[in-house]
């Protein structure tokens, strides 16, 4: 068993038909030493009486809020939450996996740039009584600060028969240096509770691994005279990180008819111009990656070629 | 050439063959995702590499105020990562494919690093693995770790170059 | 070609060393590693220890460790191994071989210890 | 030191016959696994490398089978000029150790 926060209590299960469960001693936040009786949740059963009780808990039914009282006056609160194990493993049933890049992925997280901020999300069907905390920190012998902010809702979607929701937060380290070879990385935990079920989910990574620019801004085409050919012009987004003689990016520019069948054509420059030619019903969508390191590729940004 | 007395590299020929590097670093491993194997037992071969850290100056205001601390730097990693090239993490079984883009990248460290500091002169303070012989079976591990530590290497020593290339091209 | 090419025949008395070369042509010579091992009459195969030409390195079997010395010269692409304090049960077919699993392996050398 | 125990010994075996020699090693070692076939007065020959990978040259009727501690080499119809000495050969870890070997004869 361990404190989670004040007043509230993770008790670690074994779980499996029989198991003989975790004994738990409670003890009551008061000078009183006597005329203490305990009770859970909303009943008002006694389950025993004095300033300690000690408890088998076996099964959700034995989680949930202690309160020891006197005389019809609240001492105090203990929230005693189960987190289950299995054949050797902790439970994920809060979040879904969402299986990319690989398979037990619960926490995905993007950087638009190195200062050091990023994203991080996680998906669930669950959608009451279910509350998330989320710390971090850069290594885990010696952390160095990152501060999250509180986790919002912040997509939902059906799937389905099933509602999705999506959960975001923010973090920022706090001491970022943008132009280092990070040599310790990222970790996220995020601790979630569902009912009287404690879960909690970890991600470490570079920031250099998670980075995906946004999209190529100001994307304009200008034609060159008695020629099919376009100059496809566009500018860096202004969330990267600058100066762009040292972050510098790499583009693709795509030719895109109509139809999906239609072949695309496809050239990639450093350059934030390129010459295309332009079929009729087409688009030119123009995306972003890191030019030294391989992370993701921005979204497209496109215009129409007519 | 970046002489250790202080005169400037040839930043553009930096430039080109750190950008190539970039490319060799990403083509000897590429990558779907950024496949994890970080858990996996930290070598101390991969533990002890050389970073380019926050102290270095080779961020953008360090460059311009001395280039040579983070120069020194980058030629300290791109020695050490040379000698790990061609140790018998690479060489030995299981054996590369005869075209696999790991000679060249070897061969491009080698090259930038002379570019850097020609025969004759030297920075002090070599940082060299000192390397025990690897079994065959750790083998397919360590290098996936050095790969993947010098791709972040590399990266960084490209910013430099081209950033150098750019602003402080005589 | 790519191959591997061996010293000739030796005769040694019990005592004395024997230096075998193996010339290596074909392939960069130090992007592999170079293995040398024994056969004696009738028996099979024991590995006796193995260099990294670019380095230098070497790794050697425990049983043959303070006997056996390799080494390789890589302005001429070519390993050595010297066996010292030669008995009579030293006799045998000394082989350089590249990474095993290249499967290039040099003819072999015959060496003799006989008083 | 990771042993390697080859079986059987010695076989005999006609022209066009399956043939099947095992080896078996002391601890894991995953594929890190050779075959080489000899002939008297001539170097070690290459046939299957990562246990199961067919070195380049060498005639499909060999092939490799096995991972961890148990391998098998089978020649799926024998030939003439397959008669000689198999060695199986592991390369996990130093010290690199063969097996005793096979001898594989006309019956």
């Known amino acids: 068993i361990w404190e989670l926060k004040k007043d509230v209590y993770v008790v670690e299960l074994d779980w499996y038909p029989d198991a003989p469960g975790e004994m738990v001693v409670l003890t009551c936040d008061t000078p009183e030493e006597d005329g203490i009786t305990w009770t859970l949740d909303q009943s008002s059963e006694v389950l025993g009486s004095g300033k300690t009780l000690t408890i088998q808990v076996k099964e959700f039914g034995d989680a949930g809020q202690y309160t020891c009282h006197k005389g019809g006056e609240v001492l105090s609160h203990s929230l005693l939450l189960l987190h289950k194990k299995e054949d050797g493993i902790w439970s994920t049933d809060i979040l879904k996996d969402q299986k990319e890049p690989k398979n037990k992925t619960f926490l995905r997280c993007e950087a638009k740039n190195y200062s050091g901020r990023f994203t991080c999300w996680w998906l669930t069907t669950i959608s009451t009584d279910l509350t998330f905390s989320v710390k971090s920190s850069r290594g885990s012998s010696d952390p160095q600060g990152v501060t999250c902010g509180a986790a919002t809702l912040s997509a939902e979607r059906v799937r389905g028969d099933n509602k999705e929701y999506e959960y975001s937060v923010e973090c920022q380290e706090d001491s970022a240096c943008p132009a280092a070879e990070e040599s310790l990385p990222i970790e996220v935990m995020v601790d979630a509770v569902h009912k009287l079920k404690y879960e909690n989910y970890t991600s470490s990574f570079f920031i250099r691994d998670i980075i995906k620019p946004d999209p190529p801004k100001n994307l304009q085409l200008k034609p060159l005279k008695n020629s099919r050919q376009v100059e496809v012009s566009w500018e860096y987004p202004d969330t990267w990180s600058t100066p762009h003689s040292y972050f510098s990016l790499t583009f693709c520019v795509q030719v895109q008819g109509k139809s999906k069948r239609e072949k695309k054509d496809r050239v990639f420059t450093d350059k934030t111009s390129a010459t295309v030619i332009c079929r009729k019903n087409a688009s030119i969508s123009v995306r972003a990656q890191d030019r030294y390191y391989s992370s993701s590729w921005s979204e497209w940004a496109s215009v129409p070629c007519s | 050439r970046a002489v250790p007395g202080g005169s400037s590299p040839a930043w553009t020929q930096c430039q080109q063959l750190s950008q190539k590097l970039c490319t060799l670093a990403w083509s000897a491993h590429p990558l779907v995702g950024h496949m994890d194997l970080r858990e996996e037992g930290d070598e101390e071969t991969t533990n002890d590499v050389p970073h380019i850290q926050c102290g270095d100056g080779c961020d953008p205001q360090g460059l311009r105020d001395n280039s040579q601390f983070c120069l020194q730097r980058i030629h300290q990693g791109l020695i050490f990562y040379e000698k790990l090239l061609g140790s018998d993490i690479f060489t030995g079984e299981p054996s590369l494919l005869p075209d696999s883009p790991v000679g060249q990248l070897h061969a491009s460290l080698l090259g930038l690093s002379q570019l850097l500091q020609p025969e004759g002169h030297h920075w002090e303070t070599q940082q060299i693995p000192s390397l025990s012989p690897s079994q065959p079976w750790q083998r397919l591990l360590l290098r996936f770790k050095i790969l993947r530590s010098l791709q972040a290497f590399v990266a960084v020593a490209a910013r430099v170059f081209a950033h150098g290339a750019a602003t402080l091209s005589p | 070609q790519v191959q591997l090419v061996q010293s000739g025949a030796e005769v040694k008395k019990p005592g004395s060393s024997v230096k075998v070369s193996c010339k290596a042509s074909?392939?960069?010579?130090?992007?592999?590693?170079m293995h040398w091992v024994r056969q004696a009459p009738g028996q099979g195969l024991e590995w006796m220890g193995y260099i990294n030409p670019y380095n230098d390195g070497t790794n050697y079997n425990e049983k043959f460790k303070g006997r056996v010395t390799i080494t390789a010269d890589k302005s001429t692409s070519t390993a050595y191994m010297e066996l010292s304090s030669l008995r009579s049960e030293d006799t045998a077919v000394y082989y350089c071989?590249?990474?095993?699993?290249?499967?290039?392996w040099g003819q072999g050398t015959t060496v003799t210890v006989s008083s | 030191d990771i042993q390697m125990t080859q079986s059987p010994s010695s076989l005999s075996a006609s022209v066009g016959d399956r043939v099947t020699i095992t080896c078996k090693a002391s601890?894991?070692?995953?594929?890190?696994l050779t075959w080489y076939q000899q002939k008297p007065g001539k170097a070690p020959k290459l046939l299957i490398y990562g246990a199961t990978s067919l070195e380049t040259g060498v005639p499909s009727r060999f092939s490799g089978s096995g991972s961890g501690t148990d391998f098998t080499l089978t020649i799926s119809s024998l030939q003439p000029e397959d008669f000689a000495t198999y060695y199986c050969q592991m390369y996990w870890s130093t010290p690199f150790t063969f097996g005793g070997g096979t001898k594989v004869e006309i019956k």
């Open positions: 074909g392939y960069k010579f130090t992007r592999y590693v």
């Open positions: 071989a590249r990474n095993w699993d290249t499967g290039l």
């Open positions: 601890d894991h070692i995953l594929k890190f």
